[in-house]
């Protein structure tokens, strides 16, 4: 079934942008001016998820790339990765659970909770130029709040 999708960028609550760091990793750093063109454009899709009062299930692909953020166990720890998919089959309404994030919107800030690993969130470090990762704490040192900006084509 077709899905509703949009193109956007994400910045963490410290205004760090997300950029590619090698072929399968994202990192967060402050960008200005023309460097803003480096930031990753996401294709965010509305997908099927668990019933909930106010969590909205989404998948986060990289625009015009066959890469999706996914959550898997590595060395017994929930881990965020970029995973290649067959572009003929994605996005789709019934995404595999590892690709699904519960978008939680509070006061214009977004959190992205892993559907596969509840209470684990897409996170960035306070430090500059560090990988985007899956974190198991909210409200601590690591940043789990993001803002979204539509991308005009």
């Amino acid at each position: 079934a077709p899905v509703r999708s949009l193109n956007c960028t994400l910045r963490d609550s410290q205004q760090k942008s997300l950029v590619m760091s090698g072929p399968y990793e994202l990192k967060a750093l402050h960008l200005q001016g023309q460097d803003m063109e480096q930031q990753v454009v996401f294709s965010m899709s509305f997908v099927q998820g668990e019933e909930s009062n106010d969590k909205i299930p989404v998948a986060l692909g990289l625009k015009e790339k066959n890469l999706y953020l996914s959550c898997v166990l590595k060395d017994d720890k929930p881990t965020l990765q970029l995973e290649s998919v067959d572009p003929k089959n994605y996005p789709k309404k019934k995404m595999e659970k590892r690709f699904v994030f519960n978008k939680i919107e509070i006061n214009n800030k977004l959190e992205f909770e892993s559907a596969q690993f509840p209470n684990w969130y897409i996170s960035t470090s306070q430090a500059e130029n560090m990988p985007v990762f899956l974190g198991g704490t909210k409200g601590g040192q690591d940043i789990t709040d993001f803002t979204m900006q539509f991308v005009s084509s």
Partner: antibody, heavy 119, light 108 residues
Framework: EVQLVESGGGLVQPGGSLRLSCTAS????????MAWVRQAPGKGLEWVGI???????YYASWAKGRFTISRDTSKNTVYLQMNSLRAEDTAVYYC?????????????WGQGTLVTVSS | EIVMTQSPSTLSASVGDRVIITCQAS??????LSWYQQKPGKAPKLLIY???TLASGVPSRFSGSGSGAEFTLTISSLQPDDFATYYC??????????FGQGTKLTVL
């Protein structure tokens, strides 16, 4: 004050075109999803379509091809371009803001603008 | 395309009555359902989203329930301000966002 104001409605002949505008105040359209919903006189609500970023628009099946939603973020305005209008397009047209991205429901509505298609 | 069917189309009741309006989806939409109230000449007002969550500022006499394809809107004790038309809306089943045909609530 957070509000939406529609304009551009009026009388148009069958086969004609009309562009409706919806201007937002009190918030930025740069990260808001905006929809159009219409209501024919004495009838129910009918979803027309929705716009996210400028490349991501979705329409009711009956609206595809004749109706186009666009946005101008610099003017904080969303548009509904209606072509090949028919008598059955006569309705009050509302713009509305999606409560959250992909929530599908609408918490903020404009006052509506009446479009009458008649010769 | 998912079709939303409300019943009854019209309903007459008195102040203080308990009122139930039902909405049926042509296929499962989980809990992706909203309810709106509309008064003549006015824009709709969101009452309930995700089948059972009360929108901000909506009185607690309104409640919603259901999941899958069957949903209900209940007004526990009808007030004079509640006479209006009520619409259900599928908010998440596929690309289309469909409304029910409406239920007009009138004074008995």
């Amino acid at each position: 004050e957070v509000q939406l104001v529609e304009s551009g409605g009026g009388l148009v002949q069958p086969g004609g075109s009309l562009r409706l505008s919806c201007t937002a105040s009190g918030f930025s359209l740069s990260d808001a999803a905006m929809a159009w919903v219409r209501q024919a006189p004495g009838k129910g609500l009918e979803w027309v379509g929705i716009i996210y970023d400028s490349a991501s628009t979705y329409y009711a099946s009956w609206a595809k091809g004749r109706f186009t939603i666009s946005r101008d973020t610099s003017k904080n305005t969303v548009y509904l371009q209606m072509n090949s209008l028919r008598a059955e397009d006569t309705a009050v047209y509302y713009c509305a803001r999606e409560r959250q991205i992909f929530s599908g429901d609408f918490v903020l509505w404009g006052q509506g603008t009446l479009v009458t298609v008649s010769s | 395309e998912i079709v939303m069917t409300q019943s009854p189309s019209t309903l007459s009741a008195s102040v203080g009555d308990r009122v139930i309006i039902t909405c049926q989806a042509s296929q499962s939409i989980d809990n992706w359902l909203s309810w709106y109230q509309q008064k003549p000449g006015k824009a709709p007002k969101l009452l309930i989203y995700r089948a059972s969550t009360l929108a901000s500022g909506v009185p607690s006499r309104f409640s919603g329930s259901g999941s899958g394809a069957e949903f209900t809107l209940t007004i526990s004790s009808l007030q004079p301000d509640d006479f209006a038309t009520y619409y259900c809306q599928n908010t998440g089943g596929g690309i289309n966002i469909a409304f029910g045909q409406g239920t007009k609530l009138t004074v008995l």
